[in-house]
């Protein structure tokens, strides 16, 4: 149907951006809190979102140092607004056999940005292997 | 259909700043990042940086820091790049590009020459 | 910062033929890997992204493949307003960046 693959083109193309706010905040690396953070790796088939929604709710916090904090302040807020709903997203939420945020290794703030980049190309990957030729505005 | 509307040409002195202007219609603008691109005469596509229309996020490549501020007008739909302490390095054309998956639709181009 | 070589600055086919034009990166891309067109006239158009992904409107005699680091945009049966030059660029890592271009011109 066209206009859900629309909506699902315009989710992905948000998690696109996440990609470059993710690779913003790498630059950044130095200035975060060097807390280790549950960050999923090798995330189950059927268990993205729910990985997604454990990187978005880690608490990624600037040291407050030098002139960056406002740069990734912002940046960190951005990776943390909720996505557009989806059906997929709205049918993972019901699959309860997902790994808890905590039981995921913890990472310190370069490695749990890594992995969460990876997470969100993984997403993309499914989305764009799944669909038919044409771009988001076909 | 998506369109992104430029200005052809600027003519401007050394020393001084030039902002153009991109105005996109045909889809909803703040749904989709603008990036703009420097190319020189004859030569490749340079990444400038990108903004988000929804609320003026931006990133900037390392070599135009300083040197390029994007903002954007959300109510007319136009996204707009200021270059500052113009030299001879910068007469290129300046394209702006929606991002969706890649730089899905592109503006004609401005063409800056710096020249007293 | 990733960079995208494109090996054949200029290319010369005769219309009719398959042509081949190859972009290798410096480290693996996951395929995010996107190819654009540019006419004479400066004008500038995205013919596939994500590797294979054919834009809308783009014609299917475009295609594209690759995987790693090396990728390579084709067309199968060459026209007249193909002629132009064809730039790779990377969506993997921050900054974006561009391949060189390779300029096909007509034997």
């Known amino acids: 149907h066209k206009s859900s693959s629309q909506g699902q083109d315009r989710h992905m193309i948000r998690m696109r951006q996440l990609i470059d706010i993710v690779d913003q905040l790498k630059n950044y690396v130095n200035d975060l809190v060097p807390e280790f953070l549950p960050a999923p790796e090798d995330v189950e088939t059927n268990c993205e979102w729910s990985a997604f929604s454990c990187f978005q709710k880690a608490q990624l916090k600037s040291a407050n140092t030098g002139n960056n904090e406002r740069i990734i302040n912002v940046s960190i807020k951005k990776l943390k607004r909720k996505p557009p709903s989806t059906n997929a997203g709205r049918r993972q939420k019901h699959r309860l056999t997902c790994p808890s945020c905590d039981s995921y290794e913890k990472k310190p703030p370069k490695e749990f940005l890594e992995r969460f980049k990876s997470l969100l190309q993984k997403m993309i990957h499914q989305h764009l292997s799944s669909r038919t030729h044409g771009s988001e505005d076909s | 259909q998506v369109q992104l509307q430029q200005p052809g040409s600027e003519l401007v002195m050394p020393g001084a700043s030039v902002k153009m202007s991109c105005k996109a219609s045909g889809y909803i603008f703040t749904d989709y990042w603008m990036h703009w691109v420097k190319q020189r005469p004859g030569q490749g596509l340079e990444w400038i940086g990108t903004?988000?229309?929804?609320?003026?996020?931006?990133i900037y490549s390392q070599n135009f820091k300083g040197k390029a501020t994007l903002t954007v007008d959300e109510s007319s739909s136009t996204a707009y790049m200021l270059l500052s302490s113009l030299t001879s390095e910068d007469s290129a054309v300046y394209f702006c590009?929606?991002?969706?998956?890649?730089?899905?639709?592109w503006g004609q181009g401005t063409s800056v020459t710096v020249s007293s | 910062d990733i960079q995208l070589t494109q090996t054949t600055s200029s290319l010369s086919a005769s219309l009719g033929d398959r042509v081949t034009i190859s972009c290798r990166a410096s480290?693996?891309?996951?395929?995010?890997l996107n190819w654009y067109q540019q006419t004479p006239d400066g004008t500038v158009k995205l013919l596939i992204y994500y590797t294979s992904r054919l834009h809308s409107g783009v014609p299917s005699r475009f295609s594209g493949s690759g995987s790693g680091t090396d990728y390579s945009l084709t067309i199968s049966n060459l026209e007249q307003e193909d002629i132009a030059t064809y730039f790779c660029q990377q969506g993997h890592t921050l900054p974006r960046t561009f391949g060189g271009g390779t300029k096909l011109e007509i034997k």
């Open positions: 903004i988000d229309p929804s609320d003026n996020y931006t």
């Open positions: 590009a929606r991002y969706g998956f890649a730089m899905d639709y």
């Open positions: 480290q693996d891309i996951s395929n995010f």
